[in-house]
């Protein structure tokens, strides 16, 4: 069997000869050189060589434990004369012993850290870490102690943990923002002869809200024309805050003043300015100057700094309203007028009124926009705004006339306003009723008396308030000895009835009936319409078979049995 223990080797050997490691030995070795020792594995033949006859192992190079602390090799012992192994292959370990040849190295050459300004003493800032490549399990070669070389009295470091903490009260970012701290890490527990390394820690004080906003001036003045529509910006004010970021954000509000309802203030998030804007329409003639009290405040306040005072400031804003020459203003947004359709030319319909709202109260002249009254049916008195007709009207042609009236300042024709005028034409009974259609009907030769052969309907272009009421009758000249009668149904219709039994188409093939239609309005209007009645031969069902030589234009839906 094999005879050896674990091999140990000191790192960084500087001797001139090869460093002796140890001896491989088999109890089968009789010392006669018949055994051959073979080495394989980590560094065999290169870092480690073996005397194949004696089993002595040597290291050929300077070894660094930090590069490789353990080498695993395999040993074989073979009888040269038989070629047979005398031992099974076995693994053995060469362990490299540590010396203090590595200084502590920080994980970063430069650390960056932040801590809030005004922090309490002992507030954690950052932990720095240095590692020592030497063996931590043996001696103090890798026992690191931290100390501060630069950065006092502002900061301190815990010697064992590398934790950096604040060491001074009330460090104010607005006074100083950046600190450079140098930390040393020393091995051997910090004792003499230990190796050391340093790192730089750049510490930035982060902002807290310990400063209120401040207006650089107590009063601001702006001007704006009275014509400024709501939303118009009229000026910017800016309070400054020594803090940064969220802590320097400012909200503006109007807290007092006669302009409270007339103006708004909005905060420009990019510039942190307060923009004064118009809220309601201004009127120079009503009020020329407004004063506002505007407040600038921090939306995010840290309660622990409230003892420093309120985190807001206010300023007075004076706004001067400038006069603007305004166009005339009509008394109404639109006018609705009425006139009878039988009105004579130059009949006055009504009037419009417009005034210059300016203090000057400039006189106004009126005109009709001719694009809206191409036929010049209406006219206006340029001085007093009276509207009158210049042509005859007809309701049945056009019921509503929509025109535009213009009011213009005489001294400044550029200042003008327009208003719509809606003129309704009222109905007058100036149209007679007429047949709704051309009536041509027929009667059967064998018709009986009092048979209905046609129903009559009438139309009237007028539009009486109480609705149409038509009456129907035979014209006086046809009333006596007529072969037909007219029956007024009192519902704006009438019926033509036969007056005798039987008709002879050879005696009389066509009858012309003059019918008078009257309305019931004032003045009464009437007209006479003629109904053509043809005598036809019919079958026993009353269906027309043949009439006179001319073809009968037979109205659709006519009841032939009438």
């Amino acid at each position: 069997s094999w005879m050896w223990n674990q091999f140990f080797l000191l790192e960084e050997y500087t001797g001139s000869d090869y460093q002796y490691v140890g001896k491989l030995h088999s109890d089968q070795d009789r010392g006669d050189g018949s055994l051959k020792y073979i080495l394989s594995g980590d560094g065999a033949g290169d870092l480690f060589i073996i005397n194949e006859n004696t089993g002595d192992i040597q290291a050929t190079k300077r070894l660094d434990r930090e590069e490789k602390p353990v080498y695993i090799l395999r040993a074989q012992a073979i009888n040269r004369r038989t070629g047979r192994p005398v031992e099974p292959e076995s693994e053995f370990i060469i362990k490299i012993h540590d010396i203090n040849d590595n200084e502590p190295i920080f994980t970063k050459e430069v650390y960056t850290a932040t801590v809030p300004e005004m922090s309490d003493v002992g507030t954690f800032v950052v932990q720095v870490t240095a590692t020592d490549a030497d063996d931590p399990t043996y001696g103090n070669s890798a026992k690191v102690v931290y100390s501060i070389l630069q950065g006092q009295p502002y900061f301190s470091v815990e010697s064992e943990t590398g934790i950096i903490k604040t060491a001074l009260l009330n460090m104010d970012r607005e006074n100083r923002e950046q600190y450079q701290v140098v930390i040393q890490a020393k091995d051997m527990g910090g004792q003499m002869g230990g190796l050391s390394g340093t790192t730089t820690v750049n510490i930035t004080l982060t902002d807290v809200n310990d400063n209120p906003p401040r207006f650089p001036q107590s009063t601001y003045q702006f001007k704006t024309p009275e014509s400024s529509p709501p939303g118009t910006p009229i000026g910017r004010i800016k309070a400054s805050d020594a803090d940064v970021g969220e802590n320097a954000e400012i909200e503006y509000s109007i807290t007092d003043g006669e302009g409270l309802d007339m103006f708004d203030v909005i905060t420009d998030q990019e510039t942190q300015e307060g923009i004064i804007t118009v809220k309601k329409l201004l009127d120079f003639e009503k009020k020329k100057v407004y004063t506002l009290k505007v407040e600038a405040s921090n939306p995010y306040v840290e309660p622990r700094f409230l003892y420093l005072g309120p985190f807001k400031d206010s300023a007075t804003v004076r706004i001067v309203v400038e006069d603007v020459d305004e166009p005339p203003v009509f008394s109404k947004l639109a006018y609705i007028l009425q006139i009878r359709e039988d009105a004579q030319i130059n009949t006055t319909i009504g009037s419009v009124t417009a005034q210059d709202p300016d203090a000057a109260r400039n006189p106004v002249k009126y005109s009709v926009d001719r694009h809206t009254d191409m036929d010049r049916i209406f006219n206006i008195d340029s001085g007093n705004g009276s509207i009158f007709t210049s042509k005859l009207l007809d309701r049945e042609t056009l019921l509503w006339h929509n025109i535009t009236v213009i009011a213009t300042e005489i001294n400044n024709p550029k200042q003008s306003s327009r208003v719509p005028l809606y003129i309704k034409v009222l109905d007058v009974n100036d149209n007679a009723p007429e047949f709704a259609e051309f009536y041509e009907t027929f009667v059967c030769e064998k018709a009986k008396a009092d048979q209905l052969i046609q129903t009559l309907h009438a139309v009237d272009k007028d539009d009486p308030y109480s609705g149409h009421q038509f009456s129907f009758s035979l014209a006086p000249e046809a009333a006596s000895g007529s072969n037909f009668t007219i029956q007024d149904n009192k519902d704006n219709t009438a019926g033509i009835l036969t007056r005798k039994n039987g008709y002879n188409r050879h005696e009389m093939s066509t009858y012309l009936l003059p019918v008078v239609i009257s309305d019931n309005d004032y003045p009464v209007q009437s007209s006479t319409g003629t109904v053509t009645v043809r005598v036809c031969a019919c079958d026993h069902h009353g269906n027309m078979q043949s009439c006179h030589a001319e073809a009968l234009i037979h109205p659709t839906g006519l009841s032939t049995g009438a």
Epitope: I78, N79, R80, R81, T82, G83, P85, E87, P88
Partner: antibody
Framework: EVQLQQSGPELVKPGASVRISCKAS????????MNWVKQSHGKSLEWIGD????????TYNQKFKGKATLTVDKSSSTAYMELRSLTSEDSAVYSC????????????WGQGTLVTVSA | QIVLTQSPALMSASPGEKVTMTCSAS?????MYWYQQKPRSSPKPWIY???NLASGVPARFSGSGSGTSYSLTISSMEAEDAATYYC?????????FGSGTKLEIK
């Protein structure tokens, strides 16, 4: 060049004995053990035993004790194997082989001697 | 005695194909040795001490294993590799051989 030259084929009767020789050249005969191996026709190999030419110490496979006897003649660098009480089971090719480890491991084989046991 | 069982007894492979044959020992052995034998020739030492190639053996051959399980592998079969391969143990007397794996070329 290392060579192991064996004697020629043998035809022997059952019950008889035979002696096979193996002459070594190209290396120092006493430096390495001589092994003998049997290979029956179409069959595998069997290790018979070995001899240290230095001191004629032998090691046998238990199966071949009483069947094979190994000897050497240092002066002629020759190894011998005698087989006795032959039966048909002993018909095979017998080879000498020398193994060792110098710079690297090696194994030299003789060309083999065919022994046929037949009435 | 330690019995060495080789498998397969017979196998064939195409040129370029990877070939693996195994040798299983009835008891644990420290090392395995392999020999190549072609018809009408003596065996040639092929692999020693489990994984070392004997002088002149092509690098496509490799050996591995431990305890009772060992193998010989050819990474890319060539025609000249057709032969019978025997495993052998020198750990315990009698020093036994396997029954052989005959490798043929397709």
């Amino acid at each position: 060049e290392v060579q192991l030259q064996q004697s020629g084929p043998e035809l022997v009767k059952p019950g008889a004995s035979v002696r096979i020789s193996c002459k070594a050249s190209g290396y120092t005969f006493t430096d390495y053990y001589m092994n003998w191996v049997k290979q029956s026709h179409g069959k595998s190999l069997e290790w018979i035993g070995d001899i240290d030419p230095n001191n004629a110490n032998t090691t046998y496979n238990q199966k071949f004790k009483g069947k094979a006897t190994l000897t050497v003649d240092k002066s002629s660098s020759t190894a011998y194997m005698e087989l006795r009480s032959l039966t048909s089971e002993d018909s095979a090719v017998y080879s000498c082989a020398s193994f060792g480890y110098d710079v690297e491991w090696f194994g030299y084989w003789g060309q083999g001697t065919l022994v046929t046991v037949s009435a | 005695q330690i019995v060495l069982t080789q498998s397969p007894a017979l196998m064939s492979a195409s040129p370029g194909e990877k070939v693996t044959m195994t040798c299983s020992a009835s008891s644990s052995v420290s090392y395995m040795y392999w020999y190549q034998q072609k018809p009408r020739s003596s065996p040639k030492p092929w692999i020693y001490l489990t994984s070392n190639l004997a002088s002149g053996v092509p690098a496509r051959f490799s050996g591995s294993g431990s305890g009772t399980s060992y193998s010989l592998t050819i990474s890319s079969m060539e025609a000249e590799d057709a032969a019978t391969y025997y495993c052998q143990q020198w750990s315990s007397n009698p020093f036994t051989f396997g029954s052989g794996t005959k490798l043929e070329i397709k």
